[in-house]
Amino acid sequence: QEFHFGPCQVKGVVPQKLWEAFWAVKDTMQAQDNITSARLLQQEVLQNVSDAESCYLVHTLLEFYLKTVFKNYHNRTVEVRTLKSFSTLANNFVLIVSQLQPSQENEMFSIRDSAHRRFLLFRRAFKQLDVEAALTKALGEVDILLTWMQKFYKL
């Protein structure tokens, strides 16, 4: 079994390992999230994503988690167990992103653009919150991201 984000295949990443890393810090992260009325990875970001679109979307989302979320949270936390869990997630996200090569062909532009618009909906919601709250919420929503990604884990 492996991830199939449309035409983009990802080998060597097992969802169970991602879930185990997240579950280790889930309660801590979600307890720290004080803004329960808002969601970053809202339904409209992830629903009805076509297979072709999924490669672009997962690429932009995971890159954002790596460059903005994990990177900034790493500088803010000292709890060893939390750091270890997020390092596991980050390393696996790096492995996934490194294997994703979304097509840059012109005929794919409408699919690519739609994925970027979905991503912007997420990023704009993230940027509207203050940094601390946004990071906490994004980390607490890794389960939403993993649940969506798991749909693309196939034989």
Partner: antibody, heavy 118, light 109 residues
Framework: EVQVQESGPGLVKPSQTLSLTCTVS??????????WSWIRQPPGKGLEWMGV???????YYSPSLKSRTSISRDTSKNQFSLQLSSVTPEDTAVYYC??????????WGQGTQVTVSS | QAVVTQEPSLSVSPGGTVTLTCGLS?????????PGWFQQTPGQAPRTLIY???SRHSGVPSRFSGSISGNKAALTITGAQPEDEADYYC?????????FGGGTHLTVL
């Protein structure tokens, strides 16, 4: 191809609320992942982004106008609207609505002139 | 609020090549800012040329191209035509909002 058209009063009195509507044809405002923007251009000056309503109905505004701006949509009429409160003569401008490509306007309306004067 | 900078004016000879740039006051411009470029002639509504750094809007001639050059977004016109004389604006996404630059007036002479 999608087309957008602005409408509303051409003259508004100071301290009142400016209300403009953008009517969309050639496609539904709820189809796809598109966002819908308002931009304005004071006479002889550059473009100023005012705000956007995303496909899920969430809204985002320019920090400098946030306290006075509201964007909403009426999906049954395939329209989205701009309200700008407490207007002054500095709000005199051509107001444009647009459908976004990605994070920036793609298809623009012809614009509607709004003058703020008593 | 972020400030987006553009050259106030530039000129190019017909058939020549010109590059317009778009910078951010506080940081480098990257593809994550989704740079867009717009052309406006007097009395007309703006027209979208480029969005998402490099994507040409439908119907835009291939002589217009977008890129990131150094720490700025860039619009290059290769083989400028007399009808390219206009004001050019860039726009950058700054997270939860968008900002336009002050515009560049391009003269073709």
């Amino acid at each position: 191809e999608v087309q957008v058209q602005e409408s509303g009063p051409g003259l508004v009195k100071p301290s009142q609320t400016l209300s403009l509507t953008c009517t969309v044809s050639g496609g539904s405002i709820t189809t796809g992942t598109y966002s819908w923007s308002w931009i304005r251009q004071p006479p002889g000056k550059g473009l100023e982004w005012m705000g956007v309503i995303a496909y899920d109905g969430s809204t985002y505004y320019s920090p400098s106008l946030k306290s006075r701006t509201s964007i909403s949509r009426d999906t049954s009429k395939n329209q989205f609207s701009l309200q700008l409160s407490s207007v002054t003569p500095e709000d005199t401008a051509v107001y444009y609505c647009a459908r976004d490509d990605v994070a920036a306007p793609g298809y623009w309306g012809q614009g509607t002139q709004v003058t703020v004067s008593s | 609020q972020a400030v987006v900078t553009q050259e106030p004016s530039l000129s190019v000879s017909p058939g020549g090549t010109v590059t317009l740039t778009c910078g951010l006051s506080s940081e480098s411009v990257t593809t994550s800012n989704y740079p867009g470029w717009f052309q406006q002639t007097p009395g007309q509504a703006p027209r979208t040329l480029i969005y998402s750094t490099i994507s040409r809007h439908s119907g835009v001639p291939s002589r217009f191209s977008g890129s990131i050059s150094g720490n700025k977004a860039a619009l290059t016109i290769t083989g400028a035509q007399p009808e390219d004389e206009a004001d050019y604006y860039c726009a950058l996404d700054i997270g939860s909002y968008t900002v336009f630059g002050g515009g560049t007036h391009l003269t073709v002479l």
